[in-house]
Amino acid sequence: QNASRGRRQRRMHPNVSQGCQGGCATCSDYNGCLSCKPRLFFALERIGMKQIGVCLSSCPSGYYGTRYPDINKCTKCKADCDTCFNKNFCTKCKSGFYLHLGKCLDNCPEGLEANNHTMECVSIVHCEVSEWNPWSPCTKKGKTCGFKRGTETRVREIIQHPSAKGNLCPPTNETRKCTVQRKKCQKGERGKKGRERKRKKPNKGESKEAIPDSKSLESSKEIPEQRENKQQQKKRKVQDKQKSVSVSTVH
């Protein structure tokens, strides 16, 4: 803000001088600026216990410029308002108040919520999610072979995160048990995951739609207690060859 203070001898009649410094149009020794040059705003500036008239090119924070014919001044925003466009339209509220349609409110109206970052009343935003993606393949401990019962998963994305008062997001992933007609693991899979223990032959026609047993089949992933010696492995290879005739693969 550009301030100008007049300092001139008082005249006997209107106690006013028109030969003032800077932005003052009329001034006095005691009061500083009394009126301002065109387009400047009159404001009172506190100096200690005294208020002195100054002429500003723009109004300070907490004030807005009012213009009347040949007389402009800085006018205070409302008590709860920090910056305003005019007396009835606040653009930033004081601490503890929320801005809504140019007004400063203690609490936001129904259907709106307080944004404590912007200190504004904003619309409540509810969570939005996409459609479910397709179910994943039926797996057990990351494998899609060598088991009867496993789990399959599907996911969906959050399109719109909710605001503080918005409806929470529903689950974005779902898992369910699934049943497959067991397929033999290929060499690459076996190498990675190890061998499964000897299992009972599955019934023909079992599929994902079948209701899974409460007991889930063990995975092929080895743990120390499950290690087999070479002789047992050879024995199982022969058994697997025999079984594979009756196993239909489900992808």
């Epitope: 009649h13 209107p14 106690n15 006013v16 028109q18 149009a25 009329t26 001034c27 006095s28 009061n31 500083g32 600026c33 009394l34 009126s35 301002c36 009159f42 009172l44 208020q51 002195i52 008239g53 009012t66 009347y68 014919p69 040949d70 007389i71 001044k73 006018t75 205070k76 409302k78 008590a79 007396k87």
Partner: antibody, heavy 119, light 107 residues
């Protein structure tokens, strides 16, 4: 010393136009703000409007449609016209001046002139 | 428009009394307030401007105070010549509005 003197007819008929003049001495009307204020008998003060040092005017919105404020700088006078008067416009009319927000408002007043609206 | 509510509307006091007149604005007027004294058949006379500044020649028994919406004129020791009607005026914005007046009468 700044002096202001109001003049004009003391009686105006209803629906006619009230016309008053304020003659200023001791200062030029090309500085400051020159106002009209009225006071109905036994009542309070009402601000009517002003004409500025440059000749721009501002009127009280409650009277605006009926008020005209003008000036004659050669005579150092400013005038008030109030149209379509009724008995409610009966009042003492004052002219007064101020020099800006930082100084006394209405530091100088005319003596006032009573205008009666009656047929 | 800003409304100015002045109180009391009248009061009776004796010479030497301390008298207080108040004016309440309908909104914050930021110290842009003047006080006037008017005697019957005379034009008003400005006593105080910008809330507390005394006009040259006005006795120091008159003082003004206040801020925001509430303002006070105090006559510390009432003198015979002070019996009159007193008005407040806000000039924070246009249109300017006066209080309804307070008549100070002799008790």
């Amino acid at each position: 010393e700044v002096q202001l003197v109001e003049s004009g007819p003391g009686l105006v008929k209803p629906s006619e136009t009230l016309s008053l003049t304020c003659t200023v001495s001791g200062d030029s009307i090309t500085s400051g703000y020159w106002n009209w204020i009225r006071q109905p008998p036994g009542k309070g003060l009402e601000w009517i409007g002003y004409i500025s040092y440059s000749g721009k005017t501002y009127q009280n919105p409650s009277l605006k449609s009926r008020v005209t404020i003008s000036r004659d700088t050669s005579k150092n006078q400013f005038s008030l016209k109030l149209s379509s008067v009724t008995a409610a416009d009966t009042a003492v009319y004052y002219c007064a001046t101020y020099y800006g927000y930082g100084g006394p408002w209405f530091a100088y007043w005319g003596q006032g002139t009573l205008v009666t609206v009656s047929s | 428009d800003i409304q100015m509510t002045q109180s009391p509307s009248s009061l009776s006091a004796s010479v030497g009394d301390r008298v207080t007149i108040t004016c309440k604005a309908s909104q914050d007027i930021d110290s842009y307030l003047s006080w006037f004294q008017q005697k019957p058949g005379k034009a008003p006379k400005t006593l105080i401007y910008l809330t507390n500044r005394l006009v040259d020649g006005v006795p120091s028994r008159f003082s003004g105070s206040g801020s925001g919406q509430d303002y006070t004129l105090t006559i510390s020791s009432l003198q015979p010549e002070d019996f009159a009607t007193y008005y407040c005026l806000h000039y924070d914005e246009f249109p300017l509005t006066f209080g309804q007046g307070t008549k100070v009468e002799i008790k």
